[in-house]
Amino acid sequence: PLATIPVSTTSLTSSEGSTISTPSVDISTPVTTSIVGDQCSRCKNGGFWDGLKCQCLTPYYGESCEEVVNSIDIAPPETVSAQMELTVTVTSVKFTDELKNHSSQEFREFNKTFTEQMNIVYSGIPEYVGVNITNLRLGSVVVEHDVLLRTKYTPEYKTALDNATEVVKQKITKVTTEQIMTNDNCSALMCFNTTGTQVQNITVTQYDPVEECRQKAEEYEDYFLVEYRDQKPYCISPCESGFNASKNCNHGKCQMSQNGARCLCVTTETHWYSGEDCNQGTQKSHHHHHH
């Protein structure tokens, strides 16, 4: 059973003896509380009681899962990859039935020679990982294969992989134009039919840190954003300090609500602070403003 709990008031005392009085829950949003047995576990926002404490769901934390974190862990993959589906026609090998069987000695030998040839062709491409033959068919030998590319994740990974796929196209076009049969003989490791070279399809790893950030932020998706530090993406709310998007609350504390980040201003023995960024100080005795 779920219960809606009344809003309580939280008082925060700062190191200078100041206090902040603010409703701890956004009044406009009913908060659900998980109840286990007869005992109210007070785990809000979908959190559950594990017998000792509340286990909170992202993006919540706190004793009762009532607070919103300032940053959410997002983990981009270490490496990203692309797969190119290519077809080339090898003219220096005649097709035989044994090549249809991937476990035959003939297939294994063809695979080895073809791999060696392609490793030579793509040797200058740092993203190149290898080739994988998917099918061999008559004509002399039509080789359907995948070219595999991989690179470290950076914000520009798509550009890096797109560039690598372009170089693959250039190199395979070059080799299949140059290594051709003369007088029914081939002087290269393999010879090709220039017109048989086709790129069928290119698949690139899809990873969008912004999308992951928005998904994990759930109902706060509009207020969390991605900023990069040392090529690594961080999913942060404006309440996280040290980023371009960080909110400066001056004499106050940043708190997330479903309407975004807001500053909760402090009251000290001598001043009370107001304004959107808690930058307007009013002296209690003299009623004098400092900006």
């Epitope: 090998v93 005649k94 003939e106 080895k112 060696e116």
Partner: nanobody, 123 residues
């Protein structure tokens, strides 16, 4: 395991003849491609003669009309009949094989090799 063993090399006078043999064990003799390569001192290995499973043959320009390649599938053997030998034919002759029907003279395309037999043409 494929094993190729050459024999028949030796010293011969210019204009003379020699017949090289290559015994192939563990190799399906009715399939693929068999070839003779040679390597003269200080030179690269070069293709001399080639024969496919269907009997198709091809020769290096320098030996055309003088050398003849043949294979005996029943005996799993490859032969090279060399006539009108010249001093420039002096080299180590290697038997090579591939399970594939190849039309390439590139040595790197052939995975199986013998140890070689020396042919010296000298007066």
């Amino acid at each position: 395991d494929v094993q190729l063993v050459e024999s028949g090399g030796g010293l011969v006078q210019p204009g003379g003849s020699l017949r090289l043999s290559c015994a192939a064990s563990g190799f399906p003799s009715s399939r693929g491609t068999m070839a003779w390569f040679r390597q003269a001192p200080g030179k690269e290995r070069e293709g001399v003669a080639f024969i496919n499973s269907d009997g198709r043959t091809s020769y290096a320009e320098s030996v055309k009309g003088r050398f003849t390649i043949s294979r005996d599938n029943a005996l799993s053997s490859l032969y090279l009949q060399m006539n009108s030998l010249r001093a420039e034919d002096t080299a180590v002759y290697y038997c090579a094989a591939s399970l594939l029907y190849l039309m390439t003279v590139n040595a790197a395309a052939y995975p199986y090799w013998g140890q070689g037999t020396m042919v010296t043409v000298s007066s």
